[in-house]
């Protein structure tokens, strides 16, 4: 039960954290404009990755698509491979778990197999986190570099009276979804790969006890070491898997002699 | 047909309150940011207040902060002005304005002259 | 805040001529996030209030004649009409739309000879 909870939550979690993760890419406000000398401007600058704004206090608001590739900064082309990288690989991470999703039956899928998927999709999501959270970081640590250059030379003096005002831009909110969604992606995947831990087909050390009618004497069922070590009656070294969340009743076993009166 | 139109004005004592409306017609007003600007012959036009489409932000000019309060009723397609503790210097025309492109005026009304005088 | 300064204050014209009046800000006007210039200019006939012409310091607005044109960025901003006609003879005024709160220029006087 604990396995499906952890992979169902794993899901669900990365599931916000990649549609963070797209949000925040779509967002116009990764940087905006600051208002720290001007609180009350009557013109209103923000920047995404693929447009910059500016919202007037009329409420007129224009948008300019960045329509030049090469003129571009790099480290803006940068984040924009980044998370696209993250918002890719999220998108096949999470194709790859409903599959892995162990309340989803599809046809007679092996366990191994879904915890294989289970893995697979658990590393796509926190390498998506990752690409997410160090583009956000890089656009931050840009937008850091040029705050300061900017208040460096804030007032480039014209005529002595005349001032020219240099806008500063800070962090916008695509920022902070950046690194929340990157965040829960990452947290999402880990916990996949513990569900995956869970689902992993391993042989347990004993199988579960089995009654007969005859008489007042039970007949416990044999075997239940190792299948290596010949005990028993998985003479086939048929691993025994149990999911976690199964009865007694549902343990897969092979008959023996004694199971039948 | 975009029309604006200012009453309320009239003479009033120093010290004393008067409260301007601005009635709106041939626009949505509920979809634009209104002003108050005033004009004298000694200052020419002066900036009076703002009030944006949701009724928040809202900014006044040094001169009549914490003396004006603009408002409106977009409902009504009203714009107000309450102005208290006036000034022999708040004697103007006011009028009201509509926020245009460009942080421009595009419509203004007719005006209401508001005289301080003893 | 942004002190706007026209020159001339008065401006003596005969019909048919090209008139050009000045407006200087205290502060650039230019938005980088545009590269649109904050500033308007209105004009105002005796009697009636302002009228808008140009915003955004060169788009005129619809139903403004071509004969008024502005140019000018940063701080520098220029009205020109290319042949007065006598209706244009009224004040002008230069607006700061870039930052709160918004100010004015006291206007030039536009007269006839």
């Known amino acids: 039960m604990a396995v499906t909870a952890c992979q169902g939550l794993g899901f669900v979690v990365s599931l916000i954290g990649i549609a963070g993760i797209i949000a925040a890419t779509c967002m116009d406000q990764w940087s905006t404009q600051d208002l720290y000398n001007n609180p009350v401007t009557a013109v209103f600058n923000y920047q995404g990755l693929w447009r910059s704004c500016v919202r007037e206090s009329s409420g007129f608001t224009e948008c300019r698509g960045y329509f030049t590739l090469l003129g571009l900064p790099a480290m803006l082309q940068a984040v924009r491979a980044l998370m696209i990288v993250g918002i890719v690989l999220g998108a096949i991470g999470l194709l790859v778990s409903i599959f892995a999703l162990k309340c989803i039956r599809i046809g007679s899928m092996e366990d191994s197999a879904k915890a294989n998927m289970t893995l697979t999709s658990g590393i796509m999501f926190i390498v998506s986190g990752l690409c997410a959270i160090a583009g956000v970081s890089v656009f931050a640590n840009m937008l850091v570099t040029n705050f300061w250059m900017s208040t460096a030379n804030m007032y480039t003096g014209m005529g002595g009276m005349v001032q020219t005002v240099q806008t500063r831009y800070t962090f916008g909110a695509a920022l902070f979804v950046g690194w929340v969604a990157g965040g829960l992606t990452l947290i999402g995947g880990v916990m996949m790969c513990i569900a995956c831990r869970g689902l992993a087909p391993e042989e347990t050390n004993y199988k579960a006890v089995s009654y007969h009618a005859s008489g007042h004497s039970v007949a416990y069922k044999p075997g239940g070491f190792k299948a290596s070590t010949g005990f028993g009656s998985n003479t086939k070294n048929k691993k025994i898997y149990d999911g976690g969340a199964r009865t007694e009743d549902e343990v897969q076993s092979y008959p023996s002699k004694h199971d039948y009166v | 047909d975009v029309q604006l139109v200012e009453s309320g004005g009239g003479l009033v004592q120093p010290g004393g309150s008067r409260k301007l409306s601005c009635a709106a017609s041939?626009?949505?007003?509920?979809?634009?940011?209104m002003h108050w600007i005033r004009q004298t012959p000694e200052k020419g036009l002066e900036w009076v207040a703002y009030i944006s489409s949701g009724s928040r932000p809202i900014y006044y000019a040094d001169t009549v902060k914490g003396r004006f309060t603009i408002s409106r009723d977009n409902p009504k397609n009203t714009l107000f002005l309450q102005m208290t503790s006036l000034r022999s210097e708040d004697t103007a025309m006011y009028f009201c304005?509509?926020?245009?492109?460009?942080?421009?005026?595009?419509?203004w009304g007719q005006g209401t002259l508001v005289t301080v005088s003893a | 805040d942004i002190v706007m300064t026209q020159s001339p204050s008065f401006l003596t014209v005969t019909a048919g001529e090209k008139v050009t009046m000045s407006c200087r800000s205290s502060q650039s006007l230019l938005n980088s996030g545009n590269q649109k210039n904050y500033l308007t200019w209105y004009q105002q006939k005796p009697g009636q209030p302002p009228k808008l012409l140009i915003y955004?310091?060169?788009t005129r607005e619809s139903g403004v004649p071509d004969r008024f044109t502005g140019s000018g960025s940063g701080t520098d901003f220029t009205l020109t009409i290319s042949s007065v006609q006598a209706e244009d003879l009224a004040l002008y005024y230069c607006?700061?739309?870039?930052?709160?709160?918004?100010?004015f220029g006291a206007g030039t006087k536009l007269e006839l000879k």
């Open positions: 955004w310091a060169s």
């Open positions: 304005a509509r926020f245009y492109y460009g942080n421009s005026f595009d419509h």
């Open positions: 041939g626009f949505t007003f509920s979809g634009f940011g």
């Open positions: 607006q700061n739309a870039y930052s709160f709160p918004l100010t």
